[in-house]
């Protein structure tokens, strides 16, 4: 009896998570990504805000920029020039969209210990970066690109046609930022800084989304964003390259678009420099199942860029769209013409291929019923990549090294056995020539970041182990988590179940399904998190489940492309199927089942509630899409085609939430949206609400004034408090 008595007394000193813990970020973790500046040196901002240079080989470190200097301009970020002479300091950060922001920039001269005076940068700047060699500066101000040969020099203006909401140079417009590039920039230096490539986006003909921003003034402001919804006019993109050594000599030269792409609407998808005089561009047809990779060379005689047809590589999908979420980008080898790239193999799994001349003759480097996720680095003798191969858990990420210098190439898992229980989901960051690398483990245990030797893989030191977090969690009753799979009709449904600390299989628990379910997403991942659903399990005794159904990623094309051209069908079916299986497990109170989701998850949760199954008592949709006609062209058409009669209009029409208004009658529905959502427009929820009112269906709603898709700041606290009350009421849990 003694051991169990001791155990009980220990349990009594432990407490459940509170909502306050979650909202205060009490149990958040830290990661450590070195800011590499050479093969063996990196910069890091210390706890007291000094910028410190660490030398791995000497074990020494020294401060190159003091917190006093940082504070003098209220700097929140910095960037060292590659020649190590200057640092830009970034302040007055002002967020725009997901990645974009404007800021004020100051240049500090390290050799002289003072700020560069004269020819100061204008403000606010939309994007600024150093050349990869030396200390040239490229920046975007008021949608135009400028170049400085040295920080103190006067700027050279490269473009002149930039205009707010019309012409964007060197930065993406809204849709390219969010759905194609996933960056705040659209300019790329060549490896030695000789050339600068940039995109020009012409949004002149794009319809504008307009919404009110209420602010504090007597009259609200109207925010106008050129935003192409499905089927609308898209931005017109052009790529230019300028010689930065003699920028005025011939000026920007346009890079030609492959003929097979230019014949109809198209997108530019990415640019990769190979050498200073060779560049690789990727293009995509508007119907996103054909991608063309084009390798272009500089013609010294004409001062132009030549993209021969023989250097065009076509990637086409016959079962879905091209690529995963995005078309993958190439990683070039040292010969500067062959490259490594991830795309679907003949069995429909995304794997690394080596392309030397044609895609048809590609050599497959990895294979199996799993997927290669990311190529981190290719050196003379090694290729480092991540995959979910290990032990056949799709929600894990391990780092592998393939020796490409030897034949046959040998493969080694670098991370699989390092901290096997604690660490099953890794990413990595490599120094020059992969001399050293940092591993960042995200869980399932407490995250840890470590430094390793690139040749031996030996761990050199722990960079961040989250000791404070570990100590803080010692007296917390965390929920139990398990990742398992259901086999249903030849479909594997992986799920994560979060169980109350004293879970007892013989008892009945309320169930909350948390869903995202968007194409090429993955919710069931072996990562650490102490969040709202952890609290619901720990304190409120709920079981929470996340299920990856059809349309989700990293388990092969059959699952991924199952949703092609019919969003809103199988994702919902698979959540429902999983719920039925969970009920069969015997510990779920089938009268107390709820579902909730955000964004795409709000769409799926709404459709699940309106499925007429009677399974769900209540549910929440936060910032849901309600009709694919309301969402961005680039994203929507990738999966749905066009909303035209001769394409897929019918499914656009019958996959709306509004069409199911009648079915909400028998559920409790909470609809939530920010009025300043630039991404999933408030229009989506306004239309749901209108349809429910017209159908005389009662529902609950909450709007967040002037909040975007993230519902950040004080809205977050209000949101989670509100949703907690709603769920507790639904599940008859006392407050």
């Amino acid at each position: 009896l003694r051991p169990s008595r001791v155990h009980n007394s220990e349990e009594n000193t432990m407490r459940a998570l509170t909502l306050k813990d979650i909202l205060n970020g009490t149990f958040s973790y830290k990661t450590f990504f070195p800011n590499w500046i050479s093969g063996q040196e990196y910069l890091h901002q210390s706890a007291d805000n000094n910028i410190v240079l660490y030398n791995i080989e000497t074990g020494q470190s020294y401060t190159i920029l003091s917190n006093r200097t940082m504070k003098s301009v209220n700097a929140s970020n910095y960037g060292l020039s590659p020649d190590r002479q200057f640092v830009y300091l970034e302040s007055d950060y002002s967020k725009l969209w997901r990645y974009s922001y404007t800021a004020t920039y100051y240049i500090y001269d390290l050799s002289n210990g003072e700020f560069v005076r004269g020819n100061e940068l204008p403000r606010p700047i939309q994007y600024l970066c150093w050349s990869p060699v030396g200390s040239k500066l490229a920046y975007v101000y008021q949608n135009n690109i400028y170049l400085k040969q040295r920080p103190g020099d006067p700027p050279f203006q490269i473009t002149f046609n930039g205009r707010e909401n019309k012409i964007f140079n060197g930065i993406p417009d809204w849709v390219y930022e969010e759905e194609m590039l996933a960056t705040k920039y659209a300019l790329w230096w060549s490896p030695n800084g000789k050339f600068l490539a940039y995109a020009e986006f012409n949004d002149t003909d794009i319809p504008v989304i307009a919404y009110s921003y209420y602010g504090d003034e007597q009259y609200p402001r109207t925010i106008n964003i050129p935003y192409p919804k499905a089927g609308a006019k898209n931005p017109v993109v052009r790529i230019f390259i300028i010689d930065t050594t003699y920028p005025a000599y011939v000026g920007p030269q346009e890079v030609p678009v492959p003929a097979m792409i230019a014949s109809s609407d198209y997108y530019f998808s990415w640019l990769t420099w190979v050498t200073d005089e060779r560049v690789c561009l990727q293009w995509l047809k508007r119907v996103q199942n054909v991608s063309v990779l084009s390798i272009c060379d500089f013609r010294e005689d004409w001062q132009t860029w030549d993209c021969p047809k023989t250097q065009e590589h076509i990637e086409e999908s016959r079962t879905g769209w091209a690529g995963g979420f995005f078309v993958s980008t190439p990683v070039f080898s040292y010969d500067a013409i062959s490259y490594y790239k991830i795309f679907s193999d003949k069995d429909g799994y995304k794997h690394i291929h080596y392309i030397k001349d044609t895609v048809e003759n590609a050599i497959q480097i990895t294979s199996g019923k799993w997927e290669a996720i990311n190529i981190f680095r290719v050196t003379q003798d090694s290729l480092f990549y991540s995959s979910n191969e290990f032990e056949e858990y799709p929600g894990r990420r391990n780092i592998y090294r393939i020796s490409i210098g030897s034949y046959p190439p040998s493969k080694k898992c670098v991370t699989c056995h390092l901290r096997k229980e604690r660490c099953q989901y890794y990413t990595a960051s490599f120094s020059d020539y992969a001399k050293y690398y940092a591993l960042v483990c995200y869980g399932p245990g407490i995250p840890i970041s470590t430094l390793h030797d690139g040749r031996t893989d030996q761990e050199i030191k722990i960079l961040e182990e989250n000791k404070e977090l570990e100590n803080a969690l010692k007296n917390i009753q965390l929920p139990k988590e398990e990742i398992k799979k259901l086999e249903v009709d030849e479909i594997t449904l992986w799920y994560k179940m979060i169980l109350p600390p004293q879970f007892d299989r013989s008892k009945k628990y309320p169930l909350l399904i948390q869903v995202y379910g968007g194409p090429c997403s993955q919710s069931v991942r072996s990562v650490f998190a102490v969040n709202w659903i952890s609290y619901l399990a720990s304190k409120e005794g709920m079981v929470i489940a996340l299920v990856d159904g059809r349309g989700t990623a990293f388990q092969g094309d059959k699952l991924l492309y199952a949703v092609y051209r019919k969003l809103g069908v199988y994702e919902v079916e698979d959540q429902i199927t999983a719920v039925r299986k969970f009920i069969e497990m015997g510990f779920i109170d089938e009268k107390r089942i709820a579902i909730w989701g955000w964004s795409y998850g709000g769409y799926v949760s709404s459709l699940a509630l309106a499925s007429g199954t009677g399974l769900f008592k209540c549910g929440i949709a936060v910032a849901p899409v309600s009709s694919w006609e309301y969402y961005a062209s680039v994203y929507t058409e990738r999966f749905m085609g066009l909303p035209t009669k001769d394409d897929n209009l019918e499914h656009y029409k019958n996959s709306t939430v509004m069409a199911r208004a009648e079915y909400f009658r028998n559920v409790d529905y909470l609809l939530i949206h920010g009025t300043a959502d630039d991404n999933v427009h408030f229009q989506n929820s306004a239309q749901i609400a209108k349809a429910l009112v017209n159908a005389q269906v009662d529902f609950q709603a909450m709007w967040y004034s002037d909040q975007n898709h993230g519902l950040s700041g004080l809205s977050t606290n209000h949101l989670y408090t509100h949703m907690t009350h709603f769920l507790k009421q639904c599940f008859s849990l006392s407050d």
Epitope: S38, E41, N55, Q60, T63, I64, R84, L110, D432
Partner: nanobody, 117 residues
Framework: QVQLQESGGGLVQAGGSLRLSCAAS????????MGWYRQALGNQRELVAG???????YYPDSVKGRFTISRDNDKNTIYLQMNSLKPEDTAVYYC???????????WGQGTQVTVSS
């Protein structure tokens, strides 16, 4: 106290050559990136060459192809071989960590290089 001792400067005709040396105390030299800097009268100090511990080098365009930085790890010394010198190369030349360390009175006396036309 860390010591950096530059030497090898002098007066030279345009087109001529000089080889500068910088002896550093071990604690600072071993494994660290080092640089040669110069300061002409009335101008800011600027980098002319940098070398990492593994021998990777950097030169600004103004000296590329004319100057060569090297290091002898056994002797804790870095060198700057300067060829095809021009009058505009006239300056006091210093060695230091690359980038320099703050709050560290590391700039030595330097060595004067004068290129006459």
């Amino acid at each position: 106290q860390v010591q950096l001792q530059e030497s090898g400067g002098g007066l030279v005709q345009a087109g001529g050559s000089l080889r500068l040396s910088c002896a550093a105390s071990g604690s600072i030299f071993v494994g660290n990136a080092m640089g040669w800097y110069r300061q002409a009268l009335g101008n800011q100090r600027e980098l002319v060459a940098g070398i990492t511990s593994d021998g990777t080098t950097y030169y600004p365009d103004s000296v590329k192809g004319r100057f060569t930085i090297s290091r002898d790890n056994d002797k804790n010394t870095i060198y700057l071989q300067m060829n095809s010198l021009k009058p505009e190369d006239t300056a006091v030349y210093y060695c230091n960590l690359w980038p320099p360390r703050i709050g560290f009175a590391s700039w030595g006396q330097g060595t004067q290089v004068t290129v006459s036309s």
